[in-house]
Interface confidence: low
């Protein structure tokens, strides 16, 4: 059977969801006036960078858009960006596309995404509404790095 990405609604502990604003992802409150993105998630077949301690290696995309999350350094700082790319194009590549890869780890009922390119840097939302989704190495009170994934049929 041909592989297909799994679809998830994603929210954090403060009920912030991910919203597409232009070609950026921002965190916004879960509410009727906001249209959150649906996250596409698919496992990477290449095991080159795998580390079971850190979780499963996955590609992350935005459902209905040819946009995928990737990590790049800007002015010396790891940064989360969206790139025009179909998630299935990444999946079919024999070699792992490292900038697009994240370790997906389960912590209780939550999910944590760590950059493969930049170990120790995690996808995060700010506690303030309207801020971009970003990478952080500071896991704690001011940044939310744990997300709830609600399966979408």
């Amino acid at each position: 059977r041909e592989a297909a990405p799994k679809s998830y609604a994603i929210r954090d502990s403060r009920q912030m969801v991910w919203v597409l604003s232009g070609n950026s992802l921002i965190a916004a409150p879960l509410s009727r006036s906001i249209k959150p993105v649906t996250l596409h998630l698919i496992a990477c077949r290449d095991t080159e960078f795998s580390d079971k301690e850190k979780g499963n290696m996955v590609y992350l995309g935005i459902k209905g858009k040819d946009l995928c999350l990737f990590c790049a350094e800007i002015q010396g700082k790891p940064t989360l960006q969206l790139k025009e790319k179909n998630i299935m194009d990444l999946y079919v590549e024999k070699k792992a596309q490292k900038p697009f890869l994240f370790f997906h780890n389960k912590e209780g009922s939550t999910s944590v995404f760590q950059s493969v390119s930049y170990p120790g840097w995690f996808i995060a939302t700010s506690t303030t509404s309207g801020q971009p989704i970003f990478l952080t190495k500071e896991r704690g009170i001011t940044n939310n790095t744990n997300f709830y994934l609600d399966s979408v049929e």
């Epitope: 009920q15 912030m16 879960l30 509410s31 009727r32 906001i34 939550t110 709830y148 609600d150």
Partner: antibody, heavy 122, light 111 residues
């Protein structure tokens, strides 16, 4: 039709643990996108949200009660429960269980139990 | 003191229109979180009256309507009837508290 029924002791001694159970009928407690909550109402006062547990097992608690509250689910009995430790007279209230659904957003508590009065007294 | 502020009481004669306000802040209603309204008749459990700011669950008469603007929300009841005499509560989510919050409640008296 989804129905909820609270049960548990009506009298609890100070410093002890209040334990209540909510039995769900007419639907499954594991249904996707549902959340299950507890709300209380002291005599003659307003409503206070205690906490929720959702279909993923994730819990959300009122910050002012968080250190004393545990909400859990028993899927085999189609029940969810509330435990509130170290109770005082200020915890005397009618306790309601309630449920609602996520549909791209939180839609409020649309089904409620009838409520059960818990008195904290020695 | 409640995070969401409601008037303790409002009153109106049968057939009249009354409104109940619910004032929050930039961390709840003002942060675009939805507002829900509940009606609690004497001696009974609360009942969801309005969800998602302005939506009525099936079975709720169209005499009840909700609206939201800025950091406040309102519940309007037109054609007031004796059976509307009850306590009314607003509810929202507050991200600074990471939890759901209720207003203090408003007692509606039908004169």
């Amino acid at each position: 039709e989804l129905q909820l029924q609270e049960s548990g002791p009506g009298l609890v001694k100070p410093s002890e643990t209040l334990s209540l159970t909510c039995t769900v009928s007419g639907g499954s407690i594991t249904s996707t996108n549902y959340y299950w909550g507890w709300i209380r109402q002291p005599p003659g006062k307003g409503l206070e949200w205690i906490g929720n547990i959702d279909y993923t097992g994730s819990t959300y608690y009122n910050a002012s009660l968080k250190s004393r509250v545990t909400i859990s689910v028993d899927t085999s009995k189609n029940q969810f429960s509330l435990k509130l430790s170290s109770v005082t007279a200020a915890d005397t209230a009618v306790y309601y269980c309630a449920t609602g659904k996520y549909y791209e957003t939180y839609l409020g508590f649309d089904v409620w139990g009838q409520g059960t009065l818990v008195t904290v007294s020695s | 003191e409640s995070v969401l502020t409601q008037p303790p009481s409002v009153s109106g004669a049968p057939g009249q229109r009354v409104t109940i306000s619910c004032t929050g802040s930039s961390s709840n209603i003002g942060a675009h979180y939805d507002v829900h309204w509940y009606q609690q008749l004497p001696g009974t459990a609360p009942k969801l009256l309005i969800y998602g700011n302005d939506n009525r669950p099936s079975g709720v008469p169209d005499r009840f309507s909700g609206s939201k603007s800025g950091t406040s929300a309102s519940l309007a009841i037109t054609g007031l009837q004796a059976e509307d005499e009850a306590d009314y509560y607003c509810q929202s989510y507050d991200y600074s508290l990471s939890g759901y919050v209720f207003g203090g409640g408003t007692k509606l008296t039908v004169l």
